[in-house]
Interface confidence: low
Amino acid sequence: SDAYLNASETTTLSPSGSAVISTTTIATTPSKPTCDEKYANITVDYLYNKETKLFTAKLNVNENVECGNNTCTNNEVHNLTECKNASVSISHNSCTAPDKTLILDVPPGVEKFQLHDCTQVEKADTTICLKWKNIETFTCDTQNITYRFQCGNMIFDNKEIKLENLEPEHEYKCDSEILYNNHKFTNASKIIKTDFGSPGEPQIIFCRSEAAHQGVITWNPPQRSFHNFTLCYIKETEKDCLNLDKNLIKYDLQNLKPYTKYVLSLHAYIIAKVQRNGSAAMCHFTTKSAPPSQVWNMTVSMTSDNSMHVKCRPPRDRNGPHERYHLEVEAGNTLVRNESHKNCDFRVKDLQYSTDYTFKAYFHNGDYPGEPFILHHSTSYNSKAHHHHHHHH
C-alpha cells in the first residue's frame, strides 16, 4: 500500500519471561508530492560514446523512473546529439502529475577538447602549465562551459592553470574536468614529472699554482643531478672554457702564463629540456715567476770617442713582480761595467779608446734574469789627442 503507517508500540513481559510486543496501527494516507516537485533538483551526468559520437544522460535518482516519449533504461536516456536540447518527461508511481519536464542541454563532443601542456621548456623544472584547447568547432554556447582542475590540494576554476615554485624532478598529479551547464561531461588526469633543475654549486676544495705554467683546482661535485662541468679561466680580458667530465674532481691547468692572476669559475650543467647551468664557484691564483723573455730592439750608439749610449725595449713577457734592466760591459773576458737601471737606457762613459767591447743587456724581474741581448761595439781613437786626423772604427 502507498499509505504511510504511524505506529505506536507497547511492550509487556509474558509469564514465561519472554517479551510480547503488541502494536496498535492507525492508517493514514497523506497526499503524494507531484513529480515536478519530487524531481525539481534532479542532477544528470553525461556519458560519451566515442564510436557513435552520441551522449547518454544518466539521471541521478534512487528509483527507476519513466521518461514519457523518450524511453529510458535504468534511468539512462540514450542517443543524445551534442549541443542539442532534449526534453524528458519524468514520472514515477511515488508522485503525481504534473510530471517533471527535464530539459537536457547536451554538451559538446568530448573529442573536441584536448588537455594541452603549455609549460615553457625553460621553466619546466619548477612550473607546470596545463590548458584545455578546443580543437574542433561546436554549436554549444561556450559561456556555459566551465573548467576545473585539481592538483594535489589545489583547485582551480580556469581553462588554463600554472603551478609555480615546484620541486624539480618531482611527480605531480593533476585531475581536470569540463562541465557544461554545471554537468560534468569529460575529465582527464595527467601525471607530470617536472624537469631536472639547475645543479647546485660545486664546492671548491683548493685552487692554487705551484709552478710558473701550471695550476690545479679540486672540488666536490654538487648534490643534484648533472651531466658535466664547465671550467673557465680568465686572465686579464682573455677567457678560456673547458668542458669537463662529470666524474672529475680535480683538473690540472697547463701552459699558463707565469706571474699572472687567473680567475677560475666552475659550474655544473645538465642538458634536460634545455641546458640548465648551476651556480658557478669562483677562485683565483697567481702563477709563479719564471725567467722573463729577452729585451729587444737593443741599440748601442757612440756619444763620444769613448762613450756609448745603450738602449733597449722591454721584454714581451716580464714573468715576475719587479722591473730592472741590467747592462754588463765586457772587454775580452773581463767584466768592466755592471749597471742596473729602472729603464733600459744606459750612458756608459770613460771607456778605453780603440777597444772592442761586448754589451749584454737583460731584464731582471726580481726573481729571475732574462736571456741577455748581446751587441759588440768598439770605441774610437782619442780624437782630441790626434787633431790631424779623425779615425772612426
Epitope: 601542456d117 607546470i128 596545463l130 624532478e169 582527464a188 601525471i191 607530470i192 614529472k193 634536460a272 629540456k273
Partner: nanobody
Framework: QVQLQQFGGGLVQAGGSLRLSCAAS????????MGWFRQAPGKEREFVAA????????YYADSVKGRYTISRDNAKNTGYLQMNSLKSEDTAVYYC????????????????????WGQGTLVTVSS
C-alpha cells in the same frame, strides 16, 4: 614523421625472459616520449610501461612493476622493453608507441596521446 619497427617476441616458458626492441627512423627519436602497450586476445589494449624523452622518467603498470624494465638509447634511435619472470597472463601482442608531446605533461599511460605506433609483436608465455 616517425616510423617504428619492432623486433623480439616469440614463445617463452613461464619464469623466462624476453627483450623487445623498437627502432625509430625518420625524425630524431630523442624528441619523443615512448611507451609500450599490450593487447591480450579478447581484451582491450592496456598500458605496460613508458619512458620520457631523456630516459630520466619511467612509468610502469602495477602488473609489471619489478619485472619489466623500459629503457632507451637515443644514439641508436631505439627503445627497449626487458621482460623478466614472465607469467602466462603476460601473453599478448606488444606494441611500441612514440609521441612528440613531451614538454612536462604527456599522459604517458594514455595510448590515445601517442601519435606513432609499431606493427606489434606477439609474446606467448607457456606454462
Amino acid at each position: 614523421q616517425v616510423q617504428l619497427q619492432q623486433f623480439g617476441g616469440g614463445l617463452v616458458q613461464a619464469g623466462g625472459s624476453l627483450r623487445l626492441s623498437c627502432a625509430a627512423s625518420g625524425r630524431t627519436f630523442s624528441g619523443y616520449a615512448m611507451g609500450w602497450f599490450r593487447q591480450a586476445p579478447g581484451k582491450e589494449r592496456e598500458f605496460v610501461a613508458a619512458i620520457n624523452w631523456s630516459g630520466g622518467s619511467t612509468y610502469y603498470a602495477d602488473s609489471v612493476k619489478g619485472r619489466y624494465t623500459i629503457s632507451r638509447d637515443n644514439a641508436k634511435n631505439t627503445g627497449y622493453l626487458q621482460m623478466n619472470s614472465l607469467k602466462s597472463e603476460d601473453t599478448a601482442v606488444y606494441y611500441c608507441a612514440a609521441s612528440d608531446w613531451v614538454v612536462g605533461g604527456i599522459s604517458l599511460m594514455n595510448g590515445a596521446e601517442y601519435k606513432y605506433w609499431g606493427q606489434g609483436t606477439l609474446v606467448t608465455v607457456s606454462s
